[in-house]
């Protein structure tokens, strides 16, 4: 902690400007008024203050705000953010998504810190929601950031918000994050016909259940195959090959080179042979003609 | 073996209402989408609707669009037409059939509605 | 809509005959095209789809041909039980469309 010492006679700030580089830390502790600096937060972004510098002006906030600092003053904060705790950030009541961007682009380019992830925390809580305008500056900054959410987080995420999200956004997510994330997706884009719907979707289609996968395969979509490996296999494995077929359209040829990954491995294995001979493709696995195919489901609806 | 059986038909006045039935056996039903197609007294065929293996889905023709809803029961093994608003251009036999991806692979026999004062 | 459309609509052929029906679609339906054949009161029954892959249990003389808009269906030697009116489908694009049927006759 800085001894308190009285300011020498002259020092006395009047306003933050840079002559208040060449104070010594100590000067600063005695010479700079806390409610002065509050006020006028927004130039010390513009003045090269060094770490220790900012260490002391910290210091002096935390003393005026011992409860968190005002809105005020914490869209201004500029780098001095960098200097928070997230036990700092914790105090704090962060409603504005000006105050999110600007804390933001400080962080622009690093990883997401625990600073930053307190603070879109602290945002989303005092919001409510992960509102569609929050989704789009966040993943703006952060493309990962909706695949940091649990399933639970994800859930808050109206449906509305899921035209900010772009592919890249979801590069990340496990299949129980898209589980979470398909529904809202389909429900947001259900007004749209079926080559925009699908362009739209297709991120989200690791989560679609089987029944989806069956009507997508109605609309001439023509599924690539990195899309198709990245559906849920046990989502695949009820597909007939006629609706593989359709749903792939011209890139049903891919699926030779995909045969020993899932889920097309798993998928072959569920299919008559002499059925996938009807592709011409050589897949090999199938169930051999003359078998009978059990529905053990049924049999213990039946037992 | 795949069995499809239709019931329901009969004679019924212009603007009237109906309900086909049609009993799936022989296969897992609720891993299929179905469908239904008409065919007038020497006409060739046409299709009516289909729906998804679970249901959620629902396709038709302009032509039917808005008077026959096509639905299904899974614990009953049952697709379903209602047909209401009919008219006499909807006299026909109408056949259930199973639909897989872009082919109707198996159908029933039939069942003959006509539509008539 | 996607408009099928079949010829001849009728034809006259003895056993053994060779017999071509042909069914052209209003645009592209690349090879979603599906074949059938019905007998008097009887359903409909699929013999080929894809174009020309054999539905189980269709005897090999019946084979498909064709891409895009024009489609072909071949009975190489026509037997008894074939006299039929035969229906062509595209399954490419909603609503699933049928041509109008081609009736073989016994010459």
């Known amino acids: 902690e800085v001894e308190k010492t009285a300011c020498p006679s002259g020092k006395k700030a009047r306003e933050i400007d840079e002559s208040l580089i060449f104070y010594k830390k100590w000067e600063l502790e005695a010479c700079v008024d806390a409610a002065l600096l509050a006020t006028q937060m927004d130039r010390v972004n513009a003045i090269p203050f060094t770490y220790e510098q900012l260490d002391v002006l910290k210091h002096k906030l935390d003393e005026l705000y011992p409860q968190g600092y005002p809105e005020s003053v914490i869209q201004h904060l500029g780098y001095l953010f960098l200097k928070m705790s997230p036990e700092d950030i914790r105090k704090w009541n962060v409603t504005s998504l000006e105050t999110l961007k600007a804390l933001l682009e400080v962080n622009k380019g690093h990883e997401m810190s625990p600073q930053v992830a307190t603070l879109i925390d602290r945002f989303v809580k005092g919001r409510g929601q992960l509102d569609k305008d929050t989704l789009d500056t966040l993943t703006a900054f952060y493309p990962g950031y909706l695949c940091s959410l649990s399933p639970e987080e994800l859930s808050s995420v109206p449906p509305s918000s899921i035209w900010a999200v772009r592919p890249q956004d979801l590069d990340t997510c496990d299949p129980r994050q898209l589980d979470v994330l398909y529904p809202k997706a389909r429900l947001a884009f259900q007004n749209m016909n079926g080559s925009e719907y699908f362009v739209k979707i297709q991120s989200f289609l690791g989560g679609a259940p089987t029944e989806d996968l069956k009507a997508l395969s109605q609309q001439n979509v023509s599924m690539d195959l990195a899309t198709f490996m990245k559906l849920r296999t046990d989502a695949v494995l009820p597909l007939t090959v006629a609706e593989v077929q359709k749903l792939l359209g011209p890139h049903v040829e891919g699926l030779k080179a995909e045969e020993r990954h899932r889920p097309v491995r798993d998928w072959i294995l569920r299919q008559r042979q002499d059925d996938l001979d009807t592709l011409g493709l050589g897949l090999q696995g199938g169930i051999p003609n003359g078998y009978l195919v059990l529905d053990l489901s049924m049999q213990e609806a039946l037992s | 073996e795949v069995q499809l059986v239709e019931s329901g038909g009969g004679l019924v006045q212009p603007g009237g209402s109906l309900r086909l039935s049609c009993a799936a056996s022989?296969?897992?039903?609720?891993?299929?989408?179905m469908s239904w197609v008409r065919q007038a007294p020497g006409k060739g065929l046409e299709w009516v609707a289909t729906?998804?293996?679970?249901?959620?889905?629902?396709y038709y023709p302009d032509s039917v669009k808005g008077r026959f809803t096509i639905s299904r029961d899974n614990s009953k093994n049952t697709l379903y037409l209602q047909m209401n608003s009919l008219r006499a251009e909807d006299t026909a036999v109408y056949y259930c059939?199973?639909?897989?991806?872009?082919?109707?692979?198996?159908w029933g026999q039939g069942t003959l509605v006509t539509v008539s004062s | 809509d996607i408009q099928m459309t079949q010829s001849p609509s009728s034809l006259s052929a003895s056993v053994g005959d060779r017999v071509t029906i042909t069914c052209r679609a209003s645009?592209?339906?690349?090879?979603?095209l599906n074949w059938y054949q019905q007998k008097p009161g009887k359903a409909p029954k699929l013999l080929i789809y894809?174009?020309?892959r054999l539905h189980s249990g269709v005897p090999s003389r019946f084979s498909g041909s064709g891409s895009g808009t024009d489609f072909t269906l071949t009975i190489s030697s026509l037997q008894p039980e074939d006299f039929a009116t035969y229906y062509c489908?595209?399954?490419?694009?909603?609503?699933?469309?049928f041509g109008q049927g081609t009736k073989v006759e016994i010459k």
């Open positions: 059939a199973r639909f897989d991806g872009y082919i109707f692979d198996y």
């Open positions: 022989g296969y897992t039903f609720s891993d299929y989408f």
């Open positions: 729906i998804s293996n679970g249901g959620t889905y629902t």
């Open positions: 645009q592209d339906i690349s090879n979603y």
């Open positions: 894809y174009t020309s």
């Open positions: 489908q595209q399954g490419n694009t909603l609503p699933w469309t």
